[in-house]
Amino acid sequence: MMTGTIETTGNISAEKGGSIILQCHLSSTTAQVTQVNWEQQDQLLAICNADLGWHISPSFKDRVAPGPGLGLTLQSLTVNDTGEYFCIYHTYPDGTYTGRIFLEVLESSVAEHGARFQIP
């Protein structure tokens, strides 16, 4: 029975050339987190394994930094970074929980953070 919920930073916006932190938080479950995958659409950005640590995909090494915590920091943002990002929490014994974040990279200097929201 999967009782957990994932809270994410929700719909967020950031300036071109700037950086943004993608954050998810798993709550309401005692399940053990074994691995967290970060994906952009169907492309792997990074993995944080409880035993093995962090792996950043080679194609993102220059612009992606691990953390804070299980989150991910995207740097030197471009308009092409606009889109859906997913945090996938692999847990034992519950299974897999997925959170969704939509990032919009803006040309202008006006970039506001969206509200936090929950995915059951």
Epitope: T34, Q35, N37, E39, D42, Q43, L44, I47, N49, D51, L52, G53, H55, P58, F86, I88, H90, G95, T96, T98
Partner: antibody, heavy 121, light 108 residues
Framework: QVQLVQSGAEVKKPGASVKVSCKAS????????MHWVRQAPGQGLEWMGV????????SYAQKFQGRVTLTRDTSTSTVYMELSSLRSEDTAVYYC??????????????WGQGTTVTVSS | EIVLTQSPGTLSLSPGERATLSCRAS???????LAWYQQKPGQAPRLLIY???SRATGIPDRFSGSGSGTDFTLTISRLEPEDFAVYYC?????????FGGGTKVEIK
């Protein structure tokens, strides 16, 4: 070419331990993760665990936690799998398999020839 | 853990025929984190396909993989005598990495 050569067959008594070796050649040993997979007679494949390039990091399947230990010796390009408290159900062929990527992708690209471990009283 | 169910258990075909093997996951395998292996009697498994559809180095193009989510397929377009073996699917999306029970392709 990339090669993984494993140690010979073992016969052990219940309660004993076994240590299987896997010697790698043909690639940069310190660049790849190594998995261990076992196959009981007439059965399918079962992932046991993985060890990092430096040997500092390991991850084990819950089923084998506390009973299996993976180590590696960089000087001889050898990885070891030790399984303790053996029981008859541990009778199987044990394989080492090198990962396909520069991390623990889980894609097992190159396999050793296998080591048969028989547990019998 | 993700359970992979392969079907059929045994496939009896003649050389030159087309083989279609199925692998179903108990939960969605995102981004097609699925591999296929071939194993002949007394030998170690050999990687055929990864990423659901990418052929491993040196694998002939008669082997092809497809599918996404929970349903995946390995197709051998024209069976050669050396293709008669057991085939396993494996997911590497969610640890622990798990294998299907296998499909035996035997000569009819």
């Amino acid at each position: 070419q990339v090669q993984l050569v494993q140690s010979g067959a073992e016969v052990k008594k219940p309660g004993a331990s076994v240590k299987v070796s896997c010697k790698a050649s043909g690639y940069t040993f310190t660049s790849y993760y190594m998995h261990w997979v076992r196959q009981a007679p007439g059965q399918g494949l079962e992932w046991m665990g993985v060890i990092g390039p430096s040997g500092a990091s390991t991850s084990y399947a819950q089923k084998f936690q506390g009973r299996v230990t993976l180590t590696r010796d960089t000087s001889t390009s050898t990885v070891y799998m030790e399984l303790s408290s053996l029981r008859s159900e541990d009778t199987a062929v044990y394989y080492c398999a090198r990962d396909h990527s520069d991390y623990w992708s889980g894609i097992m690209e190159v396999w050793g020839q296998g080591t048969t471990v028989t547990v019998s009283s | 853990e993700i359970v992979l169910t392969q079907s059929p258990g045994t496939l009896s075909l003649s050389p030159g025929e087309r083989a279609t093997l199925s692998c179903r996951a108990s939960q969605s395998v995102r981004s097609s984190y699925l591999a296929w292996y071939q194993q002949k009697p007394g030998q170690a498994p050999r990687l055929l396909i990864y990423g659901a559809s990418s052929r491993a180095t040196g694998i002939p193009d008669r082997f092809s993989g497809s599918g996404s989510g929970t349903d995946f397929t390995l197709t051998i377009s024209r069976l050669e005598p050396e293709d008669f073996a057991v085939y396993y699917c494996q997911q590497y999306f969610s640890p622990p990495w798990t294998f299907g029970g296998g499909t035996k392709v035997e000569i009819k």
